[in-house]
């Protein structure tokens, strides 16, 4: 999988789209997970509705939402109130049983708020760009949503 880069601005919302073959993935729930290192299981940030027919309903986990257009074949993830620590490597996944297929690898880049001059460098406009990642990326793990929360069980 190539890695698609999405740029967002701190404090704003970022929408990430993951297109897929609607026939091939018919009846499958979808998920969004974050990779926090080169190794580790892909731990879920948020997944679509338990009832596949209701996948169009937006589901939230903290500041992250997911909704699935199962006919059009587009999974959409919204990251609200984007923060620098939301940057990173993510995956859109299609679930079947205990397995998960990667639909898209996504790199979220968080740019400093142009109205906040404390740390800002030269700012780019947010958008989407393709980058060709040959690097071997296998696994992922997730993060605690808020500093101080007790996160997922550690894996190694």
């Amino acid at each position: 999988h190539n890695t698609t880069v999405f740029q967002g601005v701190a404090g704003q919302s970022l929408q990430v789209s993951c297109p897929y073959d609607s026939m091939k993935h018919w009846g499958r729930r979808k998920a969004w997970c974050r990779q926090l290192g080169e190794k580790g299981p892909c731990q879920r940030v948020v997944s679509t509705h338990n009832l596949w027919l209701l996948s169009f309903l937006r589901r939230w986990n903290g500041s992250t939402a997911i909704t699935d257009d199962t006919l059009g074949g587009t999974l959409t993830i919204t990251l609200r109130n984007l923060q620098p620590h939301d940057a990173g490597l993510y995956q859109c996944q299609s679930l079947h049983g205990s397995e998960a297929d990667t639909l898209r690898k996504v790199l979220v880049e968080v740019l400093a708020d142009p109205l906040d001059h404390r740390d800002a460098g030269d700012l780019w406009f947010p958008g989407e760009s393709e980058s060709f990642e040959d690097a071997h990326v296998e696994h992922s793990i997730s993060r605690s949503l808020l500093e101080g929360e007790i996160p997922f069980p550690p894996t190694s």
């Epitope: 940057a87 968080v110 030269d122 780019w124 793990i141």
Partner: antibody, heavy 119, light 107 residues
């Protein structure tokens, strides 16, 4: 194999300038945040600055803000640190590192380049 | 800024010993901690991230635990190549701050 190779260190007088470079190979450079971490002689580690994968935003430690400028050239797989108004307390080994985006830990490090600020 | 304090500052051990070193944060940092190993004249190497996740190629004798403000790095059976200085780092929310280090020496 991920490799980071720093260059540009040396002796400079207080108030002077220096530009460090870091040549990266073994990974898709444009998909990774990068950073510099320094270590004063006989001391611990100090994060200096970080840069997003496109170079769109930079973040600096308070100790260098306004004096150091971090940039990158993704077409050349190279990271730069422009250091101006150097002070004696900037004397350190400067390490180029690959930062895991959004997490702020450094998974690969260069061998370091020594910057000495002295009259 | 959150301060990271490591103890002890130095530690003597023999090959085969089980050793532990600690890192204390001045405020709750959840599980947002990394550990590095540094040998004299060399660059640091990442050992663990998010408290307990071993980085690629790190031997299983290295393990991490803790959450909130108190963290521990354990080497279950010290090997000759493990004598080095170990640093903890607060991660996930900047500024990224390091502890002052624990030096593991041969007894």
């Amino acid at each position: 194999e991920v490799q980071l190779l720093e260059s540009g260190g040396g002796l400079v007088q207080p108030g002077g300038s220096l530009r460090l470079s870091c040549a990266a190979s073994g990974f898709t450079f444009s998909n990774y945040y990068m950073a510099w971490v320094r270590q004063a002689p006989g001391k611990g580690l100090e994060w200096v600055a970080s840069l997003t994968n496109s170079g769109g935003s930079t973040y600096y430690a308070d100790s260098v803000k306004g004096r150091f400028t971090l940039s990158r050239d993704n077409s050349k797989n190279t990271l730069y640190l422009q250091m101006n108004s150097l002070r004696a307390e900037d004397t350190a080994v400067y390490y180029c590192t690959r930062e895991w985006a959004g997490s702020g830990y450094f998974d690969y490090w260069g061998q370091g380049t020594l910057v000495t600020v002295s009259s | 800024d959150i301060q990271m304090t490591q103890s002890p500052s130095s530690l003597s051990a023999s090959v085969g010993d089980r050793v532990t070193m600690t890192c204390k944060a001045s405020q709750n940092v959840g599980n947002n901690l990394a550990w590095y190993q540094q040998k004299p004249g060399k660059a640091p190497k990442l050992l663990l991230y998010y408290t307990s996740n071993r980085f690629t190629g790190v031997p299983s004798r290295f393990s991490g635990s803790g959450s909130g403000t108190d963290f521990t790095l354990t080497i279950s059976s010290v090997q000759p190549e493990d004598f080095a200085t170990y640093y903890c780092q607060r991660i996930y929310n900047s500024p990224w701050t390091f502890g002052q280090g624990t030096k593991l020496e041969l007894k």
